[in-house]
């Protein structure tokens, strides 16, 4: 029950996180005009990963896409790449995790297969979250650098008479959405990995008890396994993580410690 809850919660948290990463990637407000000393502006500039926008007092908003690929800063390209990789990994992770959910029955899929899929999706979510956090952080660092550079030469005088006000940009809403979403995806991934441990049958060694009866030795394995005959190096005396379907008896009699996580 605890495993199912952990897995389900991990899935939901990751789903929200990935939705947030997609939203952040599509948002136009990655950087917004810094309204230093001037909270009211007639022309407000903001920029995203794909286009830059200008909103006027008139209510008119104009957005222009970055129609060049080679002319864009390498850092921006890197951020785009990180966010897209994050989305792709997250989407694949979601797809895998749907089939891995304990509460969903798909044919005769064994618990070990579900455990593997849960682990895979968990790792994918973790990497996806890290990609998003990295992407947003790289962009934020770029903003901070540019902010202080433009502050240093805020006003570039022309003959000491005319002033050209340089537009400074600060953190936009998309950065915070990205950080939170990346964090949620990461947390969801960790939860999936924890759930995986609970889904996997334990690899516990059980020593066979030998009985010498009528010149015929029988080794008995506990937990509803069939007895194997003969002595010697009987490797089948182990509870092997063979993706094996555990019987109802086994589940009841020998609950895994991970079921109580």
């Amino acid at each position: 029950m605890a495993v199912t809850a952990c897995q389900g919660l991990g899935f939901v948290v990751s789903l929200i996180g990935i939705a947030g990463i997609i939203a952040a990637t599509c948002m136009d407000q990655w950087s917004t005009q810094d309204l230093y000393n001037n909270p009211v502006t007639a022309v407000f500039n903001y920029q995203g990963l794909w286009r830059s926008c200008v909103r006027e007092s008139s209510g008119f908003t104009e957005c222009r896409g970055y129609f060049t690929l080679l002319g864009l800063p390498a850092m921006l390209q890197a951020v785009r790449a990180l966010m897209i990789v994050g989305i792709v990994l997250g989407a694949i992770g979601l797809l895998v995790s749907i089939f891995a959910l304990k509460c969903i029955r798909i044919g005769s899929m064994e618990d070990s297969a579900k455990a593997n899929m849960t682990l895979t999706s968990g790792i994918m979510f973790i990497v996806s979250g890290l990609c998003a956090i990295a992407g947003v952080s790289v962009f934020a660092n770029m903003l901070v650098t540019n902010f202080w550079m433009s502050t240093a030469n805020m006003y570039t005088g022309m003959g000491g008479m005319v002033q050209t006000v340089q537009t400074r940009y600060t953190f936009g809403a998309a950065l915070f959405v990205g950080w939170v979403a990346g964090g949620l995806t990461l947390i969801g991934g960790v939860m999936m990995c924890i759930a995986c441990r609970g889904l996997a049958p334990e690899e516990t060694n059980y020593k066979a008890v030998s009985y010498h009866a009528s010149g015929h030795s029988v080794a008995y394995k506990p937990g509803g396994f069939k007895a194997s005959t003969g002595f010697g190096s009987n490797t089948k005396n182990k509870k092997i993580y063979d993706g094996g379907a555990r019987t109802e008896d086994e589940v009841q009699s020998y609950p895994s410690k991970h079921d109580y996580v």
Epitope: Q47, V54, E56, S58
Partner: antibody
């Protein structure tokens, strides 16, 4: 089409107050900034301030803070400007105008002449 | 505040002549975000409210004759009337629409001989 109809001219005594109205029609009144502009006889234009009727947000020219108070009534699609402590310097034609692309003022009222005289 | 300086303060021309008037701003009116200049030109005839001619420094308002052309960028702007007509007798104002408070130039009075 967009129309801005202003109240009639007024003669007021120094120290008194006057309230000018500007009734808008032909557009969504709440969605656009309404601007007020002053023009003294034979002089240039001065931006007094603006009001966003949707939420009552205002933005004033520092020169007119304390002099002009902008309000708006959404139900009647009317903007108001109250001028207080009037002096001869306040004798002017006051225009209401609606903001347009490029923050330009495309639609203008006919103007209200305020004369301050003892 | 951005100071707008217009020149000349008045000019007298003959109908059919080409006219140019200048407007200079104390700060650049060019917005880096959309590469647009937030400068507007108005025409005010006696006893009338101003009429919008040109916004974004060079975009002609609908209904404005194409003899009116706005040009310039940054801090230097020009309004050109390619062939002055009698009905163009008016005062022409430029305005900063880039930052608050919005400021107007003192105007250029156009008179016809």
């Amino acid at each position: 089409q967009v129309q801005l109809q202003q109240s009639g001219a007024g003669l007021v005594k120094p120290g008194a107050s006057v309230k000018i109205s500007c009734k808008a029609s032909g557009y969504a009144f709440s969605s656009y900034w309404m601007i007020w502009v002053k023009q003294r006889p034979g002089k240039g234009l001065e931006w007094i301030g603006q009001i966003y009727p949707g939420d009552g947000d205002t933005n004033y020219n520092g020169k007119f803070k304390g002099k002009a108070t902008l309000t708006a009534d959404k139900s009647s699609s009317t903007a108001f400007m109250q001028l207080s402590s009037l002096t001869s310097e306040d004798s002017a034609v006051y225009f209401c105008t609606r903001i347009y692309y490029g923050n330009a003022f495309a639609y203008w009222g006919q103007g209200t002449l305020v004369t301050v005289s003892a | 505040d951005i100071v707008m300086t217009q020149s000349p303060s008045s000019l007298t021309v003959t109908a059919g002549e080409k006219v140019t008037m200048s407007c200079k701003s104390s700060q650049s009116l060019l917005n880096s975000g959309n590469q647009k200049n937030y400068l507007t030109w108005y025409q005010q005839k006696p006893g009338q409210p101003p009429k919008l001619l040109i916004y974004w420094a060079s975009t002609r308002e609908s209904g404005v004759p194409d003899r009116f052309t706005g040009s310039g960028s940054g801090t230097d702007f020009t309004l050109t009337i390619s062939s002055v007509q009698a009905e163009d007798l008016a005062v022409y104002y430029c305005q900063n629409d880039y930052s608050y408070p919005f400021t107007f130039g003192s105007g250029t009075k156009l008179e016809i001989k």
